[in-house]
Each structure stands twice: as structure tokens, then as C-alpha cells.
Interface confidence: low
């Protein structure tokens, strides 16, 4: 599923991401934009053999199990395939664990490079939330 900007903002808010660990909803929408272009089916292979999955490009070396990544920790205790669902519950729940891990949203390279320090509220402007 490819979400619309406001559609995703509403879904993320429903799942409790607005101001989760101090990060406003705009941060999460911005991260999803530059990680996956709002596509729940996005996958990208990394040079270390791991793969990033879903709308927030969650990594298989640390956070989910795809049965393909040597030394996977599966800290979210989920199959990576769950992160590709049009229902973003699994991605959100895992993202909450990631953002609580100490580095906050710096865990997402695209957020660090494209969203951090910018007017992230622009990503939810005009949305009925």
C-alpha cells in the first residue's frame, strides 16, 4: 500500500506516534517519506547482507527476522514480512522500540539527513487529524 501523506499522518496518530519519546508526528511522516516514499512494501538490501523493510525501513540485522540475515537479533520479535503489511501496526510497534533504544530517531538515516532540524510540521499541514 502507498499511503497518502495525510492518510499516513492519521494512521500514525491513531497508533500513538505523535510526540512518542518527544518526536512530533511530522517527524514520523517525514521519516516515512524519505525512507520508503510512503510505501509499505518497500525493501532495500544493505551491503552487509541485511534488508530494510516497510514504511519505516526497519532493518533485519537488529529488529526483525527474515530468515536470511546472519546474526539477526530480532529485537522486535517479529517476522520482517509483517513490516510489509498495509496495516502499519507492526511497523509502528517496532519503531517505538527502536526510538526508545537510546539514539532516538537518529536510528533512521533518512530522518537524520532529510528531516532533522527542518520544518517537519509541514508534513502534516492541512491534514484533518
Amino acid at each position: 500500500k502507498v499511503f497518502g501523506r495525510c492518510e499516513l499522518a492519521a494512521a500514525m496518530k491513531r497508533h500513538g506516534l505523535d510526540n512518542y519519546r518527544g518526536y512530533s508526528l511530522g517527524n514520523w511522516v517525514c521519516a516515512a517519506k524519505f525512507e520508503s516514499n510512503f510505501n509499505t512494501q518497500a525493501t532495500n538490501r544493505n551491503t552487509d547482507g541485511s534488508t530494510d523493510y516497510g514504511i519505516l525501513q526497519i532493518n533485519s540485522r537488529w529488529w526483525c527476522n527474515d530468515g536470511r540475515t546472519p546474526g539477526s537479533r530480532n529485537l522486535c520479535n517479529i517476522p520482517c514480512s509483517a513490516l510489509l503489511s498495509s496495516d502499519i501496526t507492526a511497523s509502528v510497534n517496532c519503531a517505538k522500540k527502536i526510538v526508545s533504544d537510546g539514539n532516538g530517531m537518529n536510528a533512521w538515516v533518512a530522518w537524520r539527513n532529510r528531516c532533522k532540524g527542518t520544518d517537519v510540521q509541514a508534513w502534516i499541514r492541512g491534514c484533518r487529524l
Partner: antibody, heavy 116, light 107 residues
């Protein structure tokens, strides 16, 4: 239960192309990798590459880049592998399998014969 | 690419014998090694995943061991239905690779 049904045997001329299909049933097709494996007598099993049907992401063994092309049709839960510029070296049995690092589920295999 | 070398190439045994098949990797692959059985004109069948985990429905006479570069598939008291080819496969890195196989035949 999980099943992978491959298309039937093919006899092709050198230089031609062929498209092999693999229809998946019994699981969520979009969220598991489909792997393609080649088997020739005396050459064992060779991994050709893989496709994730939901996203269309593909990865190829360098040896088969330019030879194999993977596609998937999520409306019919079918994965395809096209082999181009066929030579006698392409004569083999081709398997699709569901990828989990290991391959628990396999198609029955498609025998390709390339002969003039 | 990671090369997997299986030995012996052929193993001739009598039903009731116990056998060990070897698979050696060209570099360490942790426990990311899987074993398959293949009979003539059939698809491979997964027996053991991640070096030692027997797959559901596989008889308990099959067991796997090893880590790093050296792996063993053991069959305790071979039955007639066990004859065929056995392949190992690694999932530690890409491209995935298979061993050349061991043929288990009746003596």
C-alpha cells in the same frame, strides 16, 4: 498448505527466450521471497536469484545477470523467470522455491531443453 | 562466493548402517547451513535448517551438527527410503551456494 506449481517442460531453439512460471498458493505471496535455482546433471544446484513479489525487489547471482529476469504478478500469485539468448548451457531443470534463507517449499521443477 | 565441499562424493551403505556426510565451507558461515535430500526426478526436500534444527516431519534418525566451516549430517540406521542425493546450502551470504552433493547408495 503451501504449494508452488511450475509451468511445463519446454523445448526451445538456441537464441530464443523462454518464460517459466511459478504459481504460489497457501500463503501470503507478496511477503516471501521467491528463489530460482538451476540444476544440471553433473553441475549440482545453482542459485540464480530472488524476487520479493510485493515490492518487485530483485537480486541476481552475478553469473546470471543478463540471462535471467524475474517478474511477479500479485493478482495471480505467480512469479516468472525469463531466460534470454538461450544456449545448450541453459538446458536444465529450473526450480522455484519459497525463500526463508533455507528453502522449505519447492516447485516440481521445469525442464528446459535447448536444441537446434 | 562461499564454496561448499561435500564428502564423500558417493557413500555405499547397507540398510541399518549409520552414516555421516560432511560439508565444509571455504569460510566461516556460523550456523547458516541447511541440508536437503533429493531423489531422482523429485525436488529437493529440506531436512535440517541452521546446521542442527530438524524440520517438522523429518524422522529423528536424521541429525545435523557443526558450526563455522565444518558440518555433518548424520543418519542413524539408514532405511531404504533414505537413498538418494544429499546437498548442503549456505545462507550466510549472497550468492547462496550449494555443495556438489553426496550420493547415498545401496551397497
Amino acid at each position: 498448505q503451501v504449494q508452488l506449481q511450475e509451468s511445463g517442460a519446454e523445448v526451445m531453439k538456441p537464441g530464443a527466450s523462454v518464460k517459466i512460471s511459478c504459481k504460489a498458493t497457501g500463503y501470503t505471496f507478496t511477503t516471501y521471497w521467491i528463489e530460482w535455482v538451476k540444476q544440471r546433471p553433473g553441475h549440482g544446484l545453482e542459485w540464480i536469484g530472488e524476487i520479493l513479489p510485493g515490492s518487485g525487489s530483485t537480486y541476481y547471482n552475478e553469473k546470471f545477470k543478463g540471462k535471467a529476469t524475474f517478474t511477479a504478478d500479485t493478482s495471480s500469485n505467480t512469479a516468472y523467470m525469463q531466460l534470454s539468448s538461450l544456449t545448450s548451457e541453459d538446458s536444465a531443470v529450473y526450480y522455484c522455491a519459497r525463500g526463508d534463507g533455507h528453502y522449505c517449499y519447492w516447485g516440481q521443477g521445469t525442464t528446459l531443453t535447448v536444441s537446434s | 562466493d562461499i564454496e561448499l565441499t561435500q564428502s564423500p562424493a558417493t557413500l555405499s551403505v547397507t540398510p541399518g548402517d549409520s552414516v555421516s556426510l560432511s560439508c565444509r565451507a571455504s569460510q566461516s558461515i556460523s550456523n547458516n547451513l541447511h541440508w536437503y535430500q533429493q531423489k531422482p526426478h523429485e525436488s529437493p526436500r529440506l531436512l535440517i535448517k541452521y546446521a542442527s534444527q530438524r524440520v517438522s516431519g523429518i524422522p529423528s534418525r536424521f541429525s545435523g551438527s557443526g558450526s563455522g566451516t565444518d558440518f555433518t549430517l548424520s543418519i542413524n540406521s539408514v532405511e531404504t527410503e533414505d537413498f538418494g542425493m544429499y546437498f548442503c546450502q549456505q545462507s550466510n551470504s549472497w550468492p547462496r551456494t550449494f555443495g556438489g552433493g553426496t550420493k547415498l547408495e545401496i551397497k
